[in-house]
Amino acid sequence: LPRWRQQWSGSGTTSRFPETVLARCVKYTEVHPEMRHVDCQSVWDAFKGAFISKYPCNITEEDYQPLVKLGTQTVPCNKTLLWSRIKDLAHQFTQVQRDMFTLEDMLLGYLADDLTWCGEFNTFEINYQSCPDWRKDCSNNPVSVFWKTVSRRFAETACGVVHVMLNGSRSKIFDKNSTFGSVEVHNLQPEKVQALEAWVIHGGREDSRDLCQDPTIKELESIISKRNIRFFCKNIYRPDKFLQCVKNPEDSSCLSGI
């Protein structure tokens, strides 16, 4: 007889989750010499240990300690790139500008990017049918706790000038309820972070407005300034040209504004 299984509102664990995590780990350690010492089987065991056999609405930061330990990796000052609602462009940027890093360019973020996972209380099975939804079921689910944990740590260890890429096409360019707005902003350390520089990415080709004057950007500036961190903002009117100029900064067309 099939065992009764809790039905959650969210989609289930990503298919081939164990194989995906293991393969990503191997690929990452091959490409990043400073992480070659990492034992990917141990990484998978630690990842699995964070949620297997546990009630998926009762996951804590503590559950991820073994994984966080194995994924320890530092980012040089001035090289942190945060993003909100514009992940693809942020990742395209760091693929070109190899000395800057989003969370997903670090081992921990790379392993989990775009994946869903959860287990069930008292069984060693992974739940591929459904996982808790943050809004409809519970916030202390394996995926949400993971991202909240690593996002907070990523922000609190950033130093120098920190950059953030924001989506200028959205009604709330800065959204207080996003991971950036609710977690990362509040964990930047004034003793270490001299400034936050926001890059507002324009969507429309003919959009010449100064989105740095948007009320939500002013709200971000206020939050940051109150934390004794300087704030700067730049409009990126042509994201395609912006990326092209990162690739080829000597191009004559890159000497004018982007």
């Epitope: 966080v68 320890t72 740590r153 260890t157 130093c159 003793e191």
Partner: antibody, heavy 122, light 112 residues
């Protein structure tokens, strides 16, 4: 409440042995690396040994290597330090501490026990 | 002889700002983060600052940490009598086996 409670200290003769215990409560013990740190009377802190969350990795200060053994029993939420061939210079208060990892920076010792005094003297 | 060097003592009067330094090398502070611990008389050490400058919850913002190159420092502003304690810096040394290293400690005296 997160707590660490050391026991097993006492007076021992040079060349003797002693086993210290550290009972953990208020947190999921098997998720954390654990460490021992000692402090000789009137002196500073000296790191002694560390053990990984699952007991598979151990590391020791040169001053105790080959004489001290760190171990843990996750089913009992207890950390141990077996001390053999004790010397007068091992006289100290021994603290156990929890090791906390942050992911993007080095770890810290975020929770400490109250310590247990080991006196090595004839 | 400690791997990390701290002044043995420091002092200040209530309300003053006091700084305690911790000097190391490229193999420890230069390439690893620094933690600071406070040890009140007759008690166990307590984590005061982690990852160079971060305060655990419950630690007053009068305490701040910073790092530059191979040196770190702990600043205490608005000094209070209850801050009288020993302060230790701690880091990791990639050139040593058993890489965890402490400074020798600084005894802070609050005068008056």
């Amino acid at each position: 409440e997160v707590q660490l409670l050391e026991s097993g200290g006492g007076l021992v003769q040079p060349g003797g042995s002693l086993r210290l215990s550290c009972a953990a409560s208020g947190f999921t013990f098997n998720n954390y690396d654990m460490t021992w740190v000692r402090q000789a009377p009137g002196k500073g802190l000296e790191w002694v040994a560390v053990i990984s969350y699952d007991g598979s990795d151990k590391d020791y200060a040169d001053s105790v290597k080959g004489r001290f053994t760190i171990s843990r029993d996750n089913s009992k939420n207890t950390l141990y330090l077996q001390m053999n061939s004790l010397r007068a210079e091992d006289t100290a208060v021994y603290y156990c501490a929890r090791v906390y990892y942050y992911g993007f920076s080095g770890p810290s010792m975020d929770v400490w026990g109250q310590g247990t005094l080991v006196t090595v003297s004839s | 002889q400690s791997v990390l060097t701290q002044p043995p003592s420091a002092s200040g009067t209530p309300g003053q700002r006091v700084t305690i330094s911790c000097s190391g090398s490229n193999s420890n502070i230069g390439s690893n983060t620094v933690n600071w611990y406070q040890q009140l008389p007759g008690t166990a050490p307590k984590l005061l600052i982690y990852s160079d400058s971060n305060r655990p919850s419950g630690v007053p913002d009068r305490f701040s940490g910073s790092k530059s190159g191979t040196s770190a420092s702990l600043a205490i502003s608005g000094l209070r009598s209850e801050d009288e304690a020993d302060y230790y810096c701690q880091s990791y040394d990639s050139s040593l086996s058993g890489s965890r290293v402490f400074g020798g400690g600084t005894k802070l005296t609050v005068l008056g």
